[in-house]
């Protein structure tokens, strides 16, 4: 019979014959012959192949480097790659999320406008007049100055963008 020019799905053409591809999770050891089947071997620990293939080497699972702020979100199998994600309190430095950095804190005088997510950093804003922040934080907004009047007190020390006002008792006018 004529040697095939094309093979069925999950097969490949080699030496004028159709051989079975190795299933996901296995790599090729030797091609089939007229008398033998394709020989495949399972991928080793921390390796995978996710398609029907004729690869002689499995791929290494992705390494979630803790020194890049990464942790394992989903452990890889012989058929799937590991999925990494950022540690709590860290966010990606790129769309592919190959590295993470700690969320930025807003310095005193600045408050959090938008809390960081896994993919975006903290957005800080300067505290406007009437508001302050005396801490470095990735969560705290600017707080309004204390209203001395509502407490029947007077301002003894004006507030700044970093400090609250200081209230004190009203001076009693002597008769």
């Amino acid at each position: 019979p004529e040697p095939p020019t094309a093979c069925r799905e999950k097969q490949y053409l080699i030496n004028s014959q159709c051989c079975s591809l190795c299933q996901p999770g296995q790599k090729l050891v030797s091609d089939c012959t007229e008398f033998t089947e394709t020989e495949c071997l399972p991928c080793g620990e921390s390796e995978f192949l996710d398609t029907w293939n004729r690869e002689t080497h499995c791929h290494q699972h992705k390494y979630c480097d803790p020194n890049l702020g990464l942790r394992v979100q989903q452990k890889g199998t012989s058929e799937t790659d590991t999925i990494c994600t950022c540690e709590e309190g860290w966010h990606c430095t790129s769309e592919a999320c190959e590295s993470c950095v700690l969320h930025r804190s807003c310095s005193p005088g600045f408050g959090v406008k938008q809390i960081a997510t896994g993919v975006s950093d903290t957005i800080c804003e300067p505290c406007p007049v009437g508001f302050f922040s005396n801490v470095s934080s990735a969560f705290e907004k600017c707080h309004p100055w204390t209203s001395c009047e509502t407490k029947d007190l007077v301002v003894q020390q004006a507030g700044t963008n970093k400090t609250d006002v200081v209230c004190g008792p009203q001076d009693r006018l002597r008769a």
């Epitope: 430095t93 790129s94 590295s99």
Partner: antibody
Framework: EVQLVQSGAEVKKPGASVKVSCKAS????????IEWVRQAPGQGLEWMGN????????KYNEKFKGRVTLTADKSTSTAYMELSRLRSEDTAVYYC??????????WGQGTTVTVSS | DIQMTQSPSSLSASVGDRVTISCRAS??????LNWYQQKPGKVPKLLIY???RLRSGVPSRFSGSGSGTDYTLTISSLQPEDVATYYC?????????FGQGTKLEIK
Amino acid sequence: EVQLVQSGAEVKKPGASVKVSCKASGYTFTTFPIEWVRQAPGQGLEWMGNFHPYNDDTKYNEKFKGRVTLTADKSTSTAYMELSRLRSEDTAVYYCARRGKLPFDSWGQGTTVTVSS
Amino acid sequence: DIQMTQSPSSLSASVGDRVTISCRASQDISNYLNWYQQKPGKVPKLLIYFTSRLRSGVPSRFSGSGSGTDYTLTISSLQPEDVATYYCQQDRKLPWTFGQGTKLEIK
């Protein structure tokens, strides 16, 4: 292809400073930190510190604190290592390396710094 | 700092020999151990990371093992091109520290 290209050899007098550059290409510079390692003649490898161009986060080996400064210019994808108050023991090859998808996965060719009076 | 101690500091073996290099950490480094190869006059090159993961493109005659404080680099069948100095490095805790190196020569 990821490449780190370092500046040329330097000869300095004791007490002087040296600034070594490391120009990165083949990847987005702000994605990964740059590590700095040195190797004295005939000796082993010694980690000096690292710098993350994404947010300028810097970590130093206590041994070099106060003498080494790590910086970067994002516009040119170049990292810098400056070592001050040089002494003869600082004679070494200085390497930059990327902490990429794998630890120290790409290295610069090295910059020889000779400190001699 | 975590101290990394390699042994031997140098060794000579014949082509085809099985070679092992040991690395001991002064405290548990939880498998965060990398191996580098530095050929004479060249730049160090990552061979193995996280104790046993072989970097893509590195020949399969290289392997790594270990846990806790004790780790090993093995070359199953020594080749002439393996002449180099090999360094272990812990990645567990800053500052990163390297072993003093093992110089491998061919008999």
